[in-house]
Interface confidence: medium
């Protein structure tokens, strides 16, 4: 850009870009400030005069440099079956995840509408697959040679002690148990814990100020003239009437 | 307490639109989905998709994509349907329900419906 | 698309006897111990009203006489004992998946 075009609005050179949080306004044929994050596009551009921001109202946000209408509006209140791990502020949305020991059963876009508890494992079984945000734990039956002798959603089989001499043999739900006083290997005290599944999963991420109307599409994905991220050249030929859509 | 207030029955002629609105109250709108049913006369209810206010968000029946279009206005706390291309098939009462995102998972409060006739 | 068949399609019950209302879906609703079957009164006239939630649970307001039960593919309805108001066309309906689908209903009357 030339050293003296140094003040939102200007027009780009001939082919050229905006620069970092400017956009590029169809109507005006300028480039414009964007938005900061927790603000909106109050009032568009003119050929003489910058965009003018206006701060997100209540319970509404917006995480990236913008220029959309409108803030975002946050994610339903928390479920009961739910802890609130990001509050909605101006620059981030909620975030829900299930409490600890659950998983979601049943989602959609925008976040999990019903926590189940995970699955326990009973003695004699061991955790096989353990639980995510999104699925339930598997059990198996333990094979041969170990055990479980806890109800657990984190446990997995652990092999029977090895004995010189055996005084109760080992089954599924009960370790062995041995007549000399120590065993000539066993596992160390206690039972052996899968981790718990670590809940990341955002209620509602960012959508894009035109929302989808398609059932499948992600909530991630960029649909009709989504603004650019902070950080891109903001190169982007939309009308901002576009957002209307 | 919850209510949906649906707008007022509509004659139509066949391959114009209509655009239907249920006004939402009692409850905080962009929270739950606003779902939209169809009812012929002397028939069974079919499920023609939802809208989530608070992102625009929508899910439609197969069968109906194309034929309604669903939209919602936060500021009004409005939801709308919008069906084209009309035909006698498309005759039916109409009428907009809430899904609570949590819970219960079941349309708990429903509008008192509006009626379309499409006829030339 | 998850299909449900309701049965009967018409039921003729005498003032306080039990009504019962089967719903039968083409794949289970069930999902982690919850059963996403609903059911819904419809007077004529008037718009569904939602009777029972998630299988078993009665929504606010509705009189003990309903009560619903089952789980993964048949379900059912029981009014008991039935009333003159109850007279009207009830529906199950499935929200474990989209499109949401509902049954044909069935017609309650009074013999």
């Known amino acids: 850009l030339p050293a003296q075009v140094a003040f939102t609005p200007y027009a780009p050179e001939p082919g050229g870009t905006c620069r970092l949080r400017e956009y590029y306004d169809q109507t005006a044929q300028m480039c414009c400030s964007k938005c900061p994050p927790g603000q909106h596009a109050k009032v568009f551009c003119t050929k003489t005069s910058d965009t003018v921001c206006d701060s997100c109202e209540d319970s509404t946000y917006t995480q990236l440099w913008n220029w959309v209408p409108e803030c975002l509006s946050c994610g339903s209140r928390c479920s009961s079956d739910q802890v609130e791990t990001q509050a909605c502020t101006r620059e981030q949305n909620r975030i829900c995840t299930c409490r600890p020991g659950w998983y979601c059963a049943l989602s959609k876009q925008e976040g999990c509408r019903l926590c189940a508890q995970l699955r326990k494992c009973r003695p004699g079984f061991g955790v096989a697959r353990p639980g995510t945000e999104t699925s339930d734990v598997v059990c198996k039956p333990c094979a041969p040679g170990t055990f479980s002798n806890t109800t657990s959603s984190t446990d997995i089989c652990r092999p029977h002690q090895i004995c010189h001499v055996v005084a109760i043999p080992g089954n599924a739900s009960m370790d062995a148990v041995c007549t000399s006083t120590s065993p000539t290997r066993s596992m160390a005290p206690g039972a052996v814990h899968l981790p718990q599944p670590v809940s990341t999963r955002s209620q509602h991420t960012q959508p894009t100020p035109a929302p989808s109307t398609a059932p499948g599409t992600s909530f991630l994905l960029p649909v009709g003239p989504s603004p650019p991220a902070e950080g891109s050249t903001g190169d982007h030929h939309h009308h901002h009437h576009h957002h209307h859509h | 307490q919850v209510q949906l207030q649906q707008s007022g029955a509509e004659l139509a002629r066949p391959g114009t639109s209509v655009k239907l609105s249920c006004k939402a109250s009692?409850?905080?709108?962009?929270?739950?989905?606003i779902d939209w049913v169809k009812q012929r006369t002397g028939q069974g209810l079919e499920w023609i998709g939802e809208i989530y206010p608070g992102s625009g968000n929508t899910y439609y029946n197969e069968k109906f994509k194309g034929k309604a279009t669903l939209t919602a206005d936060k500021s009004s706390s409005t939801a709308y349907m919008q069906l084209s291309s009309l035909t006698s098939e498309d005759s039916a009462v109409y009428f907009c329900a809430r899904s609570q995102v949590y819970g219960k998972i079941a349309m708990d409060h429903w509008g008192q419906g509006t009626s379309v006739t499409v006829s030339s | 698309d998850i299909v449900l068949t309701q049965s009967p399609a018409s039921l003729a019950v005498s003032l306080g006897q039990r009504a019962t209302i089967s719903c039968r879906a083409s794949e289970s609703v069930d999902n982690s111990g919850n059963s996403f079957m609903h059911w819904y009164q419809q007077i004529p006239g008037q718009p569904p009203k939602l009777l029972i939630y998630r299988a078993s649970n009665l929504e606010s307001g509705i009189p003990a006489r309903f009560s619903g039960s089952g789980a993964r593919t048949d379900f059912t309805l029981t009014i008991d004992p039935v009333g003159a108001v109850d007279v009207a066309t009830y529906y199950c309906q499935q929200s474990k998946e989209d499109p949401y689908t509902f049954g044909g209903g069935t017609k309650l009357e009074i013999e």
């Open positions: 009692g409850y905080t709108f962009t929270d739950d989905y």
